[in-house]
Interface confidence: low
């Protein structure tokens, strides 16, 4: 029996809902009383989700599950997941048994944008060219770890001094802190770049110097 | 920066046990699986089991159940393998690695490497 | 256990040549391969992880693909800092699994 599901990861934003596709041919004169639906997590074999004896079994899951009931007779075994978490992310295998059996397992990529950064500068007055200050990139509550790069206002890399740190909170959503140390010239203009790799979705912040004073854009 | 710093070299006699660290930084070690590889000299690399440092919740390959014991102190942020009853086929690179994404079996961030040598 | 071979275990090859290096599992692993960089110090480093993806860091010269049970790494203009020993690992099921690693030398 061939059991399809995609062979891309799927992408599902936190607190989404996200749907695992999967599916098989019936044959001719295929009845639901026939069939034996499990969704496992794929490594440690849990139970997800199952459907027996011509009957939804229910999730398993934290009840965040369903199956398509009107849709299993045509061979859509697909599972939907709610209200998506960073700690769902991973393999989950579909098994499909009629008479024949199979399975196939599809990979659920879990990501969250990240907000837009928040710039500090120390120390942040009576600033001279020469000085050397720490600025601080900072964004928030987003997955998976972020990819960071600081320019000038010329577009040029700053790729010394450069430390990033990425805790992870309760949720597995992670905050990202980005320092890089300068010294400054007559003005310019530091510009920090988060990158969400999977979304490849980019937040920009930066800080303009420029003698005195300093502004700060407003947030966008 | 994340980084995974392993103890040093240890060298031990038949039947003894030894007891070898990884200490991470950079990263919630409480939310990442921590595993141990082993490398025999000149061989391929052996997965012999990972520890989730929140709960302490272990899995071993069946060949290293009752050879390797895996814990976690979550205040130092530090892994350890014990080795017991050690015999020259111990003799190995045994490695610490970071899982990477929640069940997707990839280990993207790797310590140097401890030098285990079991010799009479 | 799923077996992983790479029957491949030296490979010689001249700077900027386009290196392929195979892997193959003994079942279908779904995508779920990785292939990682050991150094000749053994410093061991994620390259690419479920078959194509490129992890942080590894410069673009280096790809993978395959399906089923037949999957390859490909280094592009090959430079002096890849001359390493390359393994590839199933990460489908439970235990993970290495190929025996293929040793990468310069020509």
């Known amino acids: 029996l061939e059991v399809q599901v995609p062979e891309d990861p799927v992408v599902a934003l936190v607190g989404t809902d996200a749907t695992l596709c999967c599916s098989f041919s019936p044959e001719p004169g295929f009845s639901l009383a026939q069939l034996n639906l499990i969704w496992q997590l794929t490594d440690t074999k849990q139970l997800v989700h199952s459907f027996a004896e011509g009957q939804d079994q229910g999730s398993a899951y934290a009840n965040r599950t369903a199956l398509f009931p009107d849709l299993l007779a045509q061979g859509n075994a697909s599972l939907r997941l709610q209200r998506v978490r960073v700690a769902d992310e991973g393999s989950f295998t579909c098994f499909v048994s009629i008479r024949d059996f199979g399975s196939a397992a599809v990979s659920l990529q879990v990501a969250a944008p990240y907000s837009k950064p928040s710039m500090t500068l120390e120390p942040n007055k009576d600033l001279r060219p020469g000085d050397t200050v720490t600025i601080t990139c900072s964004s928030y509550r987003g997955y998976p770890e972020a990819e960071v790069f600081w320019q000038d206002g010329q577009g040029v890399p700053l790729t010394g001094n450069v430390t990033t740190s990425q805790m992870a909170n309760e949720q597995g959503l992670f905050d990202v802190h980005s320092v890089l140390r300068v010294v400054l010239g007559a003005n310019g203009t530091y510009s920090c770049l988060v990158r969400n790799p999977v979304l490849q979705q980019d937040a920009h912040g930066s800080v303009t110097i420029t003698g005195q004073p300093m502004t700060f854009p407003p947030e966008a | 920066q994340v980084q995974l710093q392993q103890s040093g070299a240890e060298l031990a006699r038949p039947g003894a046990s030894v007891k070898l660290s990884c200490k991470a930084s950079?990263?919630?070690?409480?939310?990442?699986?921590m595993q141990w590889v082993k490398q025999r000299p000149g061989q391929g690399l052996e997965w012999i089991g990972t520890?989730?440092?929140?709960?302490?919740?272990?899995r071993y390959t069946q060949k290293f159940k009752g050879k390797a014991t895996l814990t976690a102190d979550k205040s130092s942020s530090t892994a350890y393998m014990q080795l017991s009853s050690l015999a020259s086929e111990d003799s190995a690179v045994y490695y610490c690695?970071?899982?990477?994404?929640?069940?997707?079996?990839?280990?993207?961030?790797w310590g140097a490497g401890t030098t285990v040598t079991v010799s009479s | 256990d799923i077996q992983m071979t790479q029957t491949t275990s030296s490979l010689s090859a001249s700077l900027g040549d386009r290196v392929t290096i195979s892997c193959r599992a003994s079942q279908d692993i779904s995508n779920y391969l990785n292939w990682y960089q050991q150094k000749p110090d053994g410093t061991v480093k994620l390259l690419i992880y479920?078959?194509?993806r490129l992890h942080s860091g590894v410069p673009s010269r280096f790809s993978g693909s395959g399906s089923g049970t037949d999957y390859s790494l490909t280094i592009d203009n090959l430079e002096q800092e890849d001359i390493a020993t390359y393994f590839c690992q199933q990460g489908n099921t439970l235990p993970p699994t290495f190929g025996g690693g293929t040793k990468l030398e310069i020509k």
């Open positions: 950079g990263y919630t070690f409480t939310s990442y699986w």
């Open positions: 690695a970071r899982r990477g994404i929640p069940r997707l079996w990839y280990f993207d961030v």
């Open positions: 520890i989730y440092p929140g709960d302490g919740d272990t």
């Open positions: 479920y078959t194509s």
